[in-house]
């Protein structure tokens, strides 16, 4: 084993090239200079190193940069990034969006790994906020990224970044997340006209309050049932039959198919049966005619 520590004659690597692929583990360790590797990291991606070989190359960089790799090396890690642990990545200071893109490209097609999650976390914290360019990049690689953030983390998203969000980016968001995103979207799109505004705001409406839904009902927006079903139940309940009819337009007929599901079911229970009958859809379960409706929340407020 002792003789294996020295690089065999004529095997010293002068550059990182394909001649290294059949070097044994110990030969790579002995014959590849870490500083040379650091300056030629971009070549590693083109050479099919095995797992074992990549481990050796990583070990060399770890020894050269015990405090964490410089960004000039990180940007060119290529497939060596797949070998990094979250602990390794926490030592990095990644500030360039180009570096982030390069590393996300390596992981493309895979689910978000702990390494990628740590990288993104380091990057966003370094920037102080989730700006539009970053959000653009992250949602391009991971459409569900936005919905993986906590409401607290989402609060750092500036309204201007909302322009980068596509409807599919919000598919897995829960109501708590939409509650944070909706006001930002409302602010971001406030200068758009009615129909354009609705197209943009539609996918955020799961966070909209009652008064905004009432306002939309006056604008002939023809909300589809899929969007309606994602609205907050507490925001839908106070809407009148006439307001829901205006809000949905021709899609109102779809209420019948959804009458057993929230929020439609709960909304029906709050409406007078007389009013529901005006829709002509056969919706049942409203408050029977002649019954007095007491709004207990109003009563409590008055007392």
């Amino acid at each position: 084993e002792v003789e294996k520590t020295a690089c065999p004659s004529g095997k010293k690597a002068r550059e990182i090239d394909e001649s290294l692929i059949f070097y044994k583990k110990w030969e790579l360790e002995a014959c590849v200079d870490a500083a040379l590797l650091a300056t030629q990291m971009d070549r590693v991606n083109a050479i099919p190193f095995t797992y074992e070989q990549l481990d050796v190359l990583k070990h060399k960089l770890d020894e050269l940069y015990p405090q964490g790799y410089p960004e000039s090396v990180i940007q060119h890690l290529g497939y060596l990034f797949l070998k990094m642990s979250p602990e390794d990545i926490r030592k990095w200071n990644v500030t360039s969006l180009e570096t982030l893109k390069a590393l996300l490209e390596v992981n493309k097609g895979h689910e978000m790994s702990p390494q990628v999650a740590t990288l993104i976390d380091r990057f966003v914290k370094g920037r102080g906020q989730l700006d539009k360019d970053t959000l653009d990049t992250l949602t391009a690689f991971y459409p569900g990224y936005l919905c993986s953030l906590s409401p607290e983390e989402l609060s750092s998203v500036p309204p201007s970044s909302i322009w980068a969000v596509r409807p599919q980016d919000l598919d897995t968001c829960d109501p708590r997340q939409l509650d944070v995103l909706y006001p930002k979207a409302r602010l971001a799109f406030q200068n758009m006209n009615g129909s354009e505004y609705f197209v943009k705001i539609q996918s955020f409406l799961g966070g909209a309050p009652t008064e905004d839904l009432k306002a939309l009902s006056q604008q002939n927006v023809s909300m589809d049932l899929a969007t309606f079903m994602k609205l907050r139940t507490d925001a839908v309940l106070p809407l009148t039959v006439a307001e829901v009819q205006k809000l949905l337009g021709p899609h109102v007929e779809g209420l019948k198919a959804e009458e057993r599901h929230r929020p439609v079911r709960d909304w029906i229970l709050r409406q007078r049966q007389d009013d529901l009958d005006t829709l002509g859809l056969g919706l049942q379960g409203g408050i029977p005619n002649g019954y007095l409706v007491l709004d207990l929340s109003m009563q409590e407020a008055l007392s």
Epitope: E18, S19, I21, F22, K25, N45, A46, I47, P48, F49, T50, Y51, E52, Q53, D55, G78, Y79, L82, V106
Partner: antibody, heavy 122, light 106 residues
Framework: QVQLVESGGGLVKPGGSLRLSCAAS????????MSWIRQAPGKGLEWVSY????????YYADSVKGRFTISRDNAKNSLYLQMNSLRAEDTAVYYC???????????????WGQGTMVTVSS | IQLTQSPSSLSASVGDRVTITCRAS??????LAWYQQKPGKAPKLLIY???SLESGVPSRFSGSGSGTDFTLTISSLQPEDFATYYC?????????FGGGTKVEIK
């Protein structure tokens, strides 16, 4: 679409020679390392030879070393295997395959040709 | 590195859960791929990095394991799954394949 098509197989006497070709299409051939893998009738797979994208780095299994020569012509998107001093035990289906490293970061074979049969018999 | 697959063949029915194992002669981390080969056809990549499913491969196929012991599982065997399955290590050169497992109709 991405495709590899082998040709050149056939019946040859022991000690004879054969040259296999593999035509690549649908991808940037010059970016990828390529391999020849063989499968004897009713047997498993054996990695025979490997060539780097530029053609300057080559690997041979011990069983074929000194008898087989792998080469490539990137201008023609073609891979070759020159087989000399053939033996009965070289009888197999020969596949050309693309190394997946460039796409995945791992050294396995993501695209295979349909194979060409080589029979060595007197 | 030698790869030993077991069993070398098995008989199963449509709908069965099938498990094939591949054992490496030394630790290979997660550097393992699985291929499917039907008679007269080339092998087709199913799984790489021990558990990553190749795009277009049905989700009934899954891989697991790390170090020396690996498993390919078919959760509910379909008629088109009757074939021979091979493992391949890419931890170190030379790249090697397992001997194969033939899945036949019972």
């Amino acid at each position: 679409q991405v495709q590899l098509v082998e040709s050149g197989g056939g019946l040859v006497k022991p000690g004879g020679s054969l040259r296999l070709s593999c035509a690549a299409s649908g991808f940037t051939f010059s970016d990828y390392y390529m391999s020849w893998i063989r499968q004897a009738p009713g047997k498993g797979l054996e990695w025979v030879s490997y060539i780097s994208s530029s053609g300057s780095t080559i690997y041979y299994a011990d069983s074929v070393k000194g008898r087989f020569t792998i080469s490539r012509d990137n201008a023609k998107n073609s891979l070759y295997l020159q087989m000399n001093s053939l033996r009965a035990e070289d009888t197999a289906v020969y596949y050309c395959a693309r190394d997946g490293y460039r796409k995945y970061g791992y050294v396995f074979f993501d695209i295979w040709g349909q194979g060409t049969m080589v029979t060595v018999s007197s | 590195i030698q790869l030993t697959q077991s069993p070398s063949s098995l008989s199963a029915s449509v709908g069965d859960r099938v498990t094939i194992t591949c054992r490496a002669s030394q630790g290979i981390s997660s550097a393992l791929a699985w291929y499917q080969q039907k008679p007269g056809k080339a092998p087709k990549l199913l799984i790489y990095d021990a558990s990553s499913l190749e795009s277009g491969v049905p989700s009934r196929f899954s891989g697991s394991g790390s170090g020396t012991d690996f498993t390919l599982t078919i959760s509910s065997l379909q008629p088109e799954d009757f074939a021979t399955y091979y493992c391949q290590q890419f931890n170190s050169y030379p790249l090697t394949f397992g001997g194969g497992t033939k899945v036949e109709i019972k």
